[in-house]
Amino acid sequence: DAEFRHDSGYEVHHQKLVFFAEDVGSNKGAIIGLMVGGVVIA
């Protein structure tokens, strides 16, 4: 059986980022995103 291994030679770090909804609209509360490799993806 073939074994597939991802080895790019570097780690991809991720970090949770929290923004206030008020800063981008009229809603209240927090917006949570995920930054992976320097890009916010969610």
Epitope: Q15, K16, L17, V18, F19, F20, A21, E22, D23, V24, K28, G29, A30, G33
Partner: nanobody, 124 residues
Framework: EVQLLESGGGLVQPGGSLRLSCAAS????????MGWFRQAPGKGREFVAA????????YYADSVKGRFTISRDNAKNALYLQMNSLRPEDTAIYYC?????????????????WGQGTLVTVSS
């Protein structure tokens, strides 16, 4: 940019309460989301809580949720952190910070103004 000055720290027994204050100078206080961070001996500065420019929205680190309450008074240019049910692991220097709108409020790099910190020690 605003200048910030914390107060209210001290020695408290486990299970006790403290209220931290942060006084801001400058007329632009309500342009900033405000946050509290803390730094325990030998550790990095970690996010505690933040409040939006209007004071309507708040966000807390999981470790303090349900025990700490952040609030602000824009008329007095003041930020507060009510800390209840304190634990020994809450021992740290507490810093208030100001972050521009639209920046992530849970990361240190978003904050461009800091106070000098106030020491909170939780010990019996």
């Amino acid at each position: 940019e605003v200048q910030l000055l914390e107060s209210g720290g001290g020695l408290v027994q486990p299970g006790g309460s403290l209220r931290l204050s942060c006084a801001a100078s400058g007329r632009t206080f309500n342009n900033y989301n405000m946050g509290w961070f803390r730094q325990a001996p030998g550790k990095g500065r970690e996010f505690v809580a933040a409040v939006s420019r209007s004071g309507v929205s708040t966000y807390y680190a999981d470790s303090v949720k349900g025990r700490f309450t952040i609030s602000r008074d824009n008329a007095k240019n003041a930020l507060y952190l009510q800390m209840n049910s304190l634990r020994p692991e809450d021992t740290a220097i507490y810093y208030c910070g100001a972050a521009y709108r639209g920046t992530a409020i849970n990361v240190r790099r978003s904050y461009d103004s800091w106070g000098q910190g106030t020491l909170v020690t939780v010990s019996s």
